[in-house]
């Protein structure tokens, strides 16, 4: 574990003076209400801050907004409220920032009840100027930018109209009525569900899934009897009401809805749900809820077609009531995911997978840590990390686990060491190898963030009392130094750094409270002088990811290949820099049976790596059918795991079997397949804002 404050640590010299010279305070001339902050563009230094103070009156909401802009990462702010004509901005829509570096911003204004439509303020120059535009409708949702072209916007109206703008919100056209949900697909495609009877809430399960590829000139109904739909990676999913009408099944398309296949997943009843936990162009993690109010379900992982699924994890915690799951993609190391299971004794336990859901294991506890009171055996226990479920249940957990793709191997999380997640005060744990090993880095709950691609970690203690101290580490959480950033403590509300973890700046947000007033205040600290030199070749060392046993020649092989990274030495105090690119090199592994999943019609008996044929498909628990092309109906029993790059070694070829005669389905009949069909789950932008923080891809 990390050396304590008194132990010999690689101290950064003269850091107090260096940080004091780079600490910038800004007091906002506002009554304290709510504050929201957005970065505009990447590496631009532009931050927009919207403060709102509103008093709900019986008839209407009286409020005041102020808009501030910084172009130096938050060191200085300018009040630009006059650019939006001192208008009250609706905070529930936030600030809609355009994709990539488009510099586009849309703010949605609060308008009086009798007005014909809403009002937006648009900027396409990183919020230097805004144009006021009156809308011909009242928006129900935030404006959705097309990922391919930020001039194209999509919005739903309060009357369920689907509106499109092709000139960045200057002119709007209603392209369809009675729309329940709309999403941008690939290449400018728009998918939406519509109910021609007019109601979205009562008739779920009777919706049509439609598609337009020309922004509303023409439409194609790609599936019927839809309960919900989503997009994830290359997959379009729909959950479809079955013939019996009480069950739903997942259908999947990889050609934008032209053709569909039924996913080999159990159908669910009205009290259950499907949820796509993660998806990319290669595979899908799908949660299928158990019947009843169990609070758990099963995770399945798909093949590359999104149709054949293997059971990955049973008793996966996913509350039916609030929709919380602890499922997290550890983005700092390929193939790593963590989540929680609900044990038979109703305790919540953390598990981790290092191979994209192939196997789940408990998290190894730090070497020198003691097991807490939840442990039956004081010597044998594991680390349990807090995520969305802990936060939802009101535990003292201020943040979800944190990892960044450019801070290789680094994971920060709150946790406890025992047999299950503890309700006691958590500590902060850090892993530098993607979750294989952990150290206890900080006592008690903290807010934390990663700067300079992992070169610095900053943390602030979570406290109900005013604070004036931050902690920082330049060696991936082993040693910490403290810095008093102000003489006058503030009530802390948030830690903000530019998304992407490339910045050297951190902003501490809070408010000061005096006898009569309270004011927003921010402190922005630039760490550039702490890391005074640029990192050189000698500052980096090779690291083989997923290495657990160097004597094994296949050590580090995950999904058919090893990856070697160049990583910053813990002893090096230097800047990776904003342009830092992770240096990694792959090395292909020999194939083994573990590199293959069982194809449709085959399964793996327990404790066996071979796929054997299912004796009886008809009426099987997991019904599945592939229609159309002949080659879809032949199999050799094995299919390479999505993303697996192994070569040579085991090549499990069997004679090709034609499964046409064995394949049955109650849900769809072949003749309907190409005209109308049904889908399942999927993509970015969930149906429920609860999932935004965790990036849950889709929840019915």
């Amino acid at each position: 574990s990390a050396p304590g404050e008194d132990e010999e640590c690689g101290r950064v010299r003269d850091f107090v003076a260096k940080l004091a010279n780079n600490t910038h305070q800004h007091v906002f001339d506002d009554l304290r209400g709510s504050v929201s902050l957005s970065w505009v563009g990447d590496s631009t230094g532009v931050i927009l801050v919207l403060t709102t103070f509103h008093v709900p009156l019986v008839i209407m909401t009286f409020g005041q907004s102020k808009l501030y802009r910084s172009e130096d990462y938050g060191k200085n702010f300018k009040d630009i409220t006059d650019l939006i004509n001192n208008t009250f901005i609706r905070t529930e829509f936030g600030m809609a920032i355009g994709p990539e570096n488009s510099g586009k911003v849309v703010l949605t204004a609060e308008v009086s009840g009798g007005s014909r439509g809403g009002r937006i303020f648009r900027s396409s120059d990183f919020a230097k100027n805004f144009v006021q535009t009156d809308l011909p409708f009242h928006p129900l949702t935030q404006m959705m930018y097309s990922p391919q072209n930020s001039d194209y916007l999509l919005a739903l109206s309060t009357e369920n109209g689907l509106w499109v703008s092709k000139n960045f919100g200057g002119k709007w056209e209603e392209i369809h009525k009675t729309v329940c949900l709309a999403k941008w697909g690939r290449k400018g495609t728009i998918f939406f569900t519509a109910n021609h009877n007019g109601s979205c809430s009562n008739d779920r399960g009777m919706l049509e899934l439609e598609r337009t590829t020309d922004y509303g000139k023409s439409f194609k109904t790609v599936a019927s009897k839809i309960y919900s739909f989503g997009l994830g990676g290359k997959f379009l999913f729909a959950s479809v009401m079955t013939g019996k009408g009480t069950l739903r099944a997942i259908h999947v398309s990889v050609d934008d809805g032209d053709t569909w296949n039924m996913a080999q997943l159990p159908p669910v009843g009205h009290e259950q749900f499907y949820s796509i936990l993660a998806a990319n162009d290669e595979m899908v993690f799908m949660h299928v809820d158990e019947p009843g109010d169990s609070g758990f379900g099963t995770i399945y992982v798909s093949d590359d077609r999104g149709t054949v699924y293997s059971k990955s994890l049973e008793r996966h915690l996913y509350t039916t009531t609030g929709g919380e799951t602890d499922f997290i993609n550890v983005t700092s190391l390929r193939g790593v995911f963590t989540t929680s299971i609900l044990a038979e004794d109703k305790s919540v336990q953390s598990v981790i997978s290092f191979d994209q859901g192939g196997e789940w294991v408990p998290l190894r506890k730090p070497a020198d840590s003691k097991c807490d009171a939840t442990a039956r055996d004081p010597e044998k226990c594991s680390l349990h990390i807090h995520a969305a479920y802990s936060i939802a249940t009101g535990l003292n957990v201020p943040m979800l686990p944190l990892s960044e793709p450019n801070a290789v191997g680094l994971v920060l999380a709150h946790g406890s060491v025992g047999d299950a997640i503890s309700v006691m005060r958590p500590d902060v744990y850090v892993s530098d190898d993607g979750g294989y090993t952990w150290i206890k880095a900080l006592e008690g709950p903290h807010y934390y963030t990663i700067l300079d691609s992992g070169g610095i970690i900053v943390a602030i203690e979570h406290s109900s009392r005013p604070i004036n101290v931050i902690k920082f580490s330049t060696d991936e959480g082993q040693c910490w130094q403290t810095y008093t950033f102000t003489r006058d403590p503030i009530y802390f509300t948030g830690l903000a750094s530019e998304p992407g973890a490339r910045s050297m700046n951190i902003s501490i947000w809070g408010f000061t409270e005096s006898f009569l007033t309270s004011q927003w205040v921010s402190y922005t600290i630039d760490f550039k002088d702490i890391l005074e030199r640029n990192c050189e070749e000698k500052d980096y060392t090779i690291w083989l990811a997923h290495s657990t046993d160097p004597e094994d020649y296949e050590d580090g092989c995950i999904l058919g290949y090893k990856e070697q990274f160049l990583r910053l030495r813990k002893s090096s105090v230097c800047q990776n820099g904003r342009d830092y690119v992770v240096t990694k090199q792959p090395s292909i592994c020999l194939c083994s049976l573990e590199d293959f999943l069982c194809d449709f019609g085959y399964y793996r008996p327990e404790n066996d790596s071979k796929c054997v044929e299912q004796p009886e498909l008809k009426g099987h628990d997991l019904e599945f059918c592939l229609y159309g092309r002949e080659e879809h109906l032949t199999t050799n029993g094995y299919r390479k795991i999505p993303g697996d790059k192994c070569q040579g070694g085991v090549n499990p070829v069997r004679e090709v079997k034609d499964l046409k005669k064995k394949c049955t389905s109650n849900f769809l009949s072949p003749e309907k397949q190409n005209s109308k069909s049904n889908g399942s789950a999927g993509g970015s932008g969930g149906l429920n804002d609860i999932f935004e923080a965790q990036k849950i891809e889709w929840h019915e």
Partner: antibody, heavy 124, light 108 residues
């Protein structure tokens, strides 16, 4: 002094068997992967076989697979190579070599200590 | 096909020369490469491991570089005792632990 000493080489007829031994001293033998490498007269080095510290992982070159068996006795600080069905092309100096391995993830190691070699001649 | 190809197979040089020997892998092997020196009738001696790390006790005129598929061993200023055969060996590809065919460094 860290040392590896091979023994057991000699002249053997094609189809015959031979057992090579390697005695280790001066280091904790049970902590290291061990290897056999051979060198035919006037030729280059050829890796033959490898065994991990606790014998969990055993690897062979394709040219000897099914004919040679590597083993070790950590209590005796000894490494062995049982060679069956010997062929003329197995004629070589056989070296015993230690593989030094870094901590997990931090490097790939190398054959840092070599024995002086023992000559195996397969001829009728 | 051979996993590792060394070039040149032989090389003549003079004392004080800077000499470079290359080793090419048929597939990426990250930094999992070592270099050895063998003198006639002697045992191979480790020079470089992990592609660029100098083995303890080896003179600093020896250096290694490269990663992925292309690697080099450089002797910055040849000494009389450096005339020998040099082998590269990989620890991350197939066939396992395979050696290059060797480069014989001779005196002019």
């Amino acid at each position: 002094e860290v040392q590896l000493v091979e023994s057991g080489g000699g002249l053997v007829k094609p189809g015959g068997s031979l057992r090579l031994s390697c005695a280790a001293s001066g280091f904790t033998f049970s902590s290291y992967s061990m290897n056999w490498v051979r060198q035919a007269p006037g030729k280059g080095l050829e890796w033959v076989s490898s065994i991990s510290s606790s014998s969990s992982y055993i690897y062979y070159a394709d040219s000897v697979k099914g004919r040679f068996t590597i083993s070790r006795d950590n209590a005796k600080n000894s490494l062995y190579l049982q060679m069956n069905s010997l062929r003329a092309e197995d004629t070589a100096v056989y070296y015993c070599a230690r593989r030094r391995i870094a901590a997990a993830g931090t490097g790939y190691g190398a054959f840092d200590i070599w024995g002086q070699g023992t000559m195996v001649t397969v001829s009728s | 096909a051979r996993q590792l190809t060394q070039s040149p197979s032989s090389l003549s040089a003079s004392v004080g020369d800077r000499v470079t020997i290359t080793c090419r892998a048929s597939q990426g092997i990250t930094s999992a490469l070592a270099w050895y020196q063998q003198k006639p009738g002697k045992v191979p001696k480790l020079l470089i491991y992990d592609a660029s790390s100098l083995e303890s006790g080896v003179p600093s005129r020896f250096s290694g570089s490269g990663s992925g598929t292309d690697f080099t061993l450089t002797i910055s200023s040849l000494q009389p005792e450096d005339f020998a055969t040099y082998y590269c060996q990989q620890f991350n590809g197939y066939p396992m632990f395979s050696f290059g065919q060797g480069t014989k460094l001779e005196i002019i």
